[in-house]
Amino acid sequence: SETTTGTSSNSSQSTSNSGLAPNPTNATTK
């Protein structure tokens, strides 16, 4: 198996969960 490492250039050391809804629901079917 392979191993790879990723490094973000973002300087914050705390992952921001702010890009995702806190209590998401499924998208409605239209």
């Epitope: 973000s8 705390s14 992952t15 921001s16 702010s18 806190p22 998401p24």
Partner: antibody
Framework: EVKFEESGGGLVQPGGSIKLSCAAS????????MDWVRQTPEKGLEWVAE??????????YYAESVKGRFTISRDDSKSRVYLQMNNLRTEDTGIYYC??????WGQGTSVTVSS | DIVMTQTPLSLSVTIGQPASISCKSS???????????LNWLQQRPGQSPKRLIY???KLDPGIPDRFSGSGSETDFTLKISRVEAEDLGIYYC?????????FGGGTKLEIK
């Protein structure tokens, strides 16, 4: 410095299983919502699964295409997130990225499902 | 699923000139808490994606302020005020409002 190190990718036969692992460092892992996202030339970026933190009772979410076949889990004591992939299909082939709620990303590990 | 549609598919920009990418969602991305979970990601050649912007217009730490995001509901735009050589790559919009999270098909930015 934040690092996400993925491992476990490789070649597997259709119907087979594989377990991916992602080790995080330099980040407050226990508070991070962790996702797996895959990338293929055909479908582009495709979200696979997510596991949230202790505060949200480690709730998990899955894409419909992997529900019942894939299981996401985490070990906060080791700052690791896992993706157990069972009953693999050729369409599961791709580069699998571990990401902290789309904020920090690993470099990806390649999974090829082929006979 | 919410479908994210990006335009153009690709664009070629001279260094120092502005660039603009559009992203349209098939449903409103406004969440019940009043926030809109629209993200922009950059993927440089041979690298993994990196988030630039979250919640439509908030820049992630370390992202140059030449990047900006705007829009609401179903219509969003990523702007680069002055393109630099390091900006080449593919840009994706991604919604985090409704499951499953979905991505746009990408816009390839090339340098003239």
């Amino acid at each position: 410095e934040v690092k996400f190190e993925e491992s476990g990718g490789g070649l597997v036969q259709p119907g087979g299983s594989i377990k991916l692992s992602c080790a995080a460092s330099g980040v407050t892992f226990s508070e991070a919502w962790m996702d797996w996202v895959r990338q293929t030339p055909e479908k582009g970026l495709e979200w696979v699964a997510e596991i949230r933190d202790r505060e949200t009772k480690y709730v998990t979410y899955y894409a419909e295409s992997v529900k019942g076949r894939f299981t996401i889990s985490r070990d906060d004591s080791k700052s690791r997130v896992y993706l157990q992939m069972n009953n693999l299909r050729t369409e599961d082939t791709g580069i699998y990225y571990c990401t902290g709620a789309m904020d920090y990303w690993g470099q990806g590990t390649s999974v090829t499902v082929s006979s | 699923d919410i479908v994210m549609t990006q335009t153009p598919l690709s664009l070629s920009v001279t260094i120092g000139q502005p660039a603009s990418i559009s992203c349209k969602s098939s449903q409103s991305l406004l969440y019940s808490n009043g926030k809109t979970y629209l993200n922009w990601l950059q993927q440089r050649p041979g690298q993994s994606p990196k988030r630039l912007i979250y919640q439509v217009s908030k820049l992630d730490p370390g992202i140059p302020d030449r990047f900006s995001g705007s829009g609401s509901e179903t219509d969003f735009t990523l702007k680069i005020s002055r393109v630099e050589a390091e900006d080449l790559g593919i840009y994706y919009c991604m919604q985090g409002t409704s499951l499953p999270w979905t991505f746009g098909g990408g816009t390839k930015l090339e340098i003239k």
